[in-house]
Amino acid sequence: DWVVAPISVPENGKGPFPQRLNQLKSNKDRDTKIFYSITGPGADSPPEGVFAVEKETGWLLLNKPLDREEIAKYELFGHAVSENGASVEDPMNISIIVTDQNDHKPKFTQDTFRGSVLEGVLPGTSVMQVTATDEDDAIYTYNGVVAYSIHSQEPKDPHDLMFTIHRSTGTISVISSGLDREKVPEYTLTIQATDMDGDGSTTTAVAVVEILDANDNAPMFDPQKYEAHVPENAVGHEVQRLTVTDLDAPNSPAWRATYLIMGGDDGDHFTITTHPESNQGILTTRKGLDFEAKNQHTLYVEVTNEAPFVLKLPTSTATIVVHVEDVNEAPVFVPPSKVVEVQEGIPTGEPVCVYTAEDPDKENQKISYRILRDPAGWLAMDPDSGQVTAVGTLDREDEQFVRNNIYEVMVLAMDNGSPPTTGTGTLLLTLIDVNDHGPVPEPRQITICNQSPVRQVLNITDKDLSPHTSPFQAQLTDDSDIYWTAEVNEEGDTVVLSLKKFLKQDTYDVHLSLSDHGNKEQLTVIRATVCDCHGHVETCPGPWKGG
């Protein structure tokens, strides 16, 4: 029959070439002379000339060695024609399968593989995967089947078999206990890939396993005991730097220290922060310390890490004895701001109050006093006793120096320490009103018509406070009552001035006496301009000119 079974040809054949493979034969050759030919890739199309056929015998020839990794199968067509060129058979399919030889070594996809695993993990934990390829066939033969193995491990601590590799997948896993980054931060494994499923050619690569840090080491104080000296009253003062060592990875959360004052800071006087570079604990004062109250503090500070410990670890504690140093403290006025009520206008030399300071220091220091700020110059202060006396007239109504009835004075106390220190106090004199001002009308100039005049309403003001103000009383004096009337309204805070007789156009003085509720009298002269006009007027009209 005009058929041929698939032909298997090993790659890398050594010849001699041409090499006979199989014979094409048509049974029509009994009737006529047959000529054979082949077509297809590998015959008459690229790669041309790999195969040929003996025209008259039909022997299929291989002209050169084959490479399975280049072309694994050739599909050709065989043809049979008579002498006159007429086809005597249908084209026949010829399959040539190139069988594999183990002519390639495995190749790792990288020269160096990198992986990582947390220190202290359990056996069985996967680390990384390595991959090698082999161009040879791994389906029908073992030529391309790669088996992985670990050839060596450096360093060999704590022993030489810390890792294992899955022979088929190349997955590297931990096989032993004892991965400790602080002892061995990195392992270098020489890995092998061997074809023939482990019985053939071998190639090597390197797998570098980084051991990642876990917080398995507690920070430890070094030293554990400290003594420090701090001046009293200093706030934000650096007391002491506490040093710790931690075997975990520097600048990682497992290394960075967190400090906590565990005891000895009853008054919440101290605070502790971590220095970002040195990792030291910086102990500072949050509040001023008081030598007189407590001259020594014993603090207990515990250190942990930013990251939680991965296992139960004992925490380190430091003891800091803080000695408070005495400083010459400023006298303190008691109270710092003193309110004193005093009548305005008291006689010169009259005592106002005694305002003294206390010295926090335990020594009996002498305190001297003086006035620091007395805007109106109304007061004096005895340097020894702190007695404040009036040396000027205290005027509640003095708007330049008195605000809301209060006159503010700053006083100073100085001790005789070396160097001397000073403290200030504020004396707030609440000035009690005295009826020292009479009522005053506003305005004091009016313009009025001499015919059908409009009543003039004047407001009454009094600088004093109630009850030294309204209701007011009005009285005209010096014959002003001949031409004018003055009446205080119901509320008692305005006076109505009326022209009761005709006056020719001119300017007149109206003598008005006003008295307040405390009978304090004030005489005021009102300048009245009388105009020749009817009713309401603001300014006198000029002389009328007829046409």
């Epitope: 947390l118 056996p123 996967s126 294992t164 022979r167 088929s168 997948t169 991965v310």
Partner: antibody, heavy 117, light 111 residues
């Protein structure tokens, strides 16, 4: 000589708790991962839980996850297994074992845990 | 993870040799040379008799030997003795879980 000595087993009602201990001697305890393996009556060995030498890593079989807690105190050379919400199927002899190279190298004599009402 | 497969029982006469098989997969027995064998006498704790396929801990008789081919490991005991009667468990390091997978156990009877 390596010795592992379990204790803490006994009879407990379903839903109850027990704490097993395993005292180790004769080797550097903190260098070895440790495991608990159990054997139900007439049955084979079943791995239960493991803990790394430092105590930083722990693993559990799915059957006990969330109910059992493994821990160790390296200062006392002691391994623990806290067993909560116990079930009838947890009835077994519990062994502690030290991990060698790819194998449970040394075993304790076991402690019996019976969960029954 | 299913257990490694062992025959439920084997038997032999004193002086004979027996072999116990332990069949796993390409992810356990076939993948690693970390197969171990344990001997357990009734009422006693398991005892390691072979590790890393064929390594005997000190004190274990050289009548015990191990081998592995593909996904199957084997324990061989030569010159059977009455005290060899016990349960034998294989275990293998395996991918994806921590620690070892155990076989179901084989009861060895010395006739």
């Amino acid at each position: 000589e390596v010795q592992l000595l379990e204790s803490g087993g006994g009879l407990v009602q379903p839903g109850g708790s027990l704490r097993l201990s395993c005292a180790a001697s004769g080797f550097t305890f903190s260098s070895y991962a440790m495991s608990w393996v159990r054997q139900a009556p007439g049955k084979g060995l079943e791995w239960v839980s493991a803990i790394s030498g430092s105590g930083g890593s722990t693993y559990y079989a799915d059957s006990v996850k969330g109910r059992f807690t493994i821990s160790r105190d390296n200062s006392k050379n002691t391994l623990y297994l806290q067993m909560n919400s116990l079930r009838a199927e947890d009835t077994a002899v519990y062994y502690c074992a030290s991990w060698g190279l790819g194998s449970n190298e040394n075993w304790g004599q076991g402690t019996m845990v019976t969960v029954s009402s | 993870q299913s257990a490694l497969t062992q025959p439920a029982s084997v038997s032999g006469s004193p002086g004979q040799s027996i072999t116990i098989s332990c069949t796993g997969t390409s992810n356990d027995v076939g993948a690693y040379n970390y197969v171990s064998w344990y001997q357990q006498h009734p009422g006693k704790a398991p005892k390691l008799i072979l590790s890393e396929v064929n390594k005997r801990p000190s004190g274990v008789s050289n009548r015990f030997s191990g081998s592995k081919s593909g996904n199957t490991a084997s324990l061989s005991i030569s010159g059977l003795q009455a005290e060899d009667e016990a349960d034998y468990y294989c275990s293998s390091f395996t991918s994806g879980i921590v620690f070892n997978l155990f076989g179901g156990g084989t009861k060895l009877t010395v006739l």
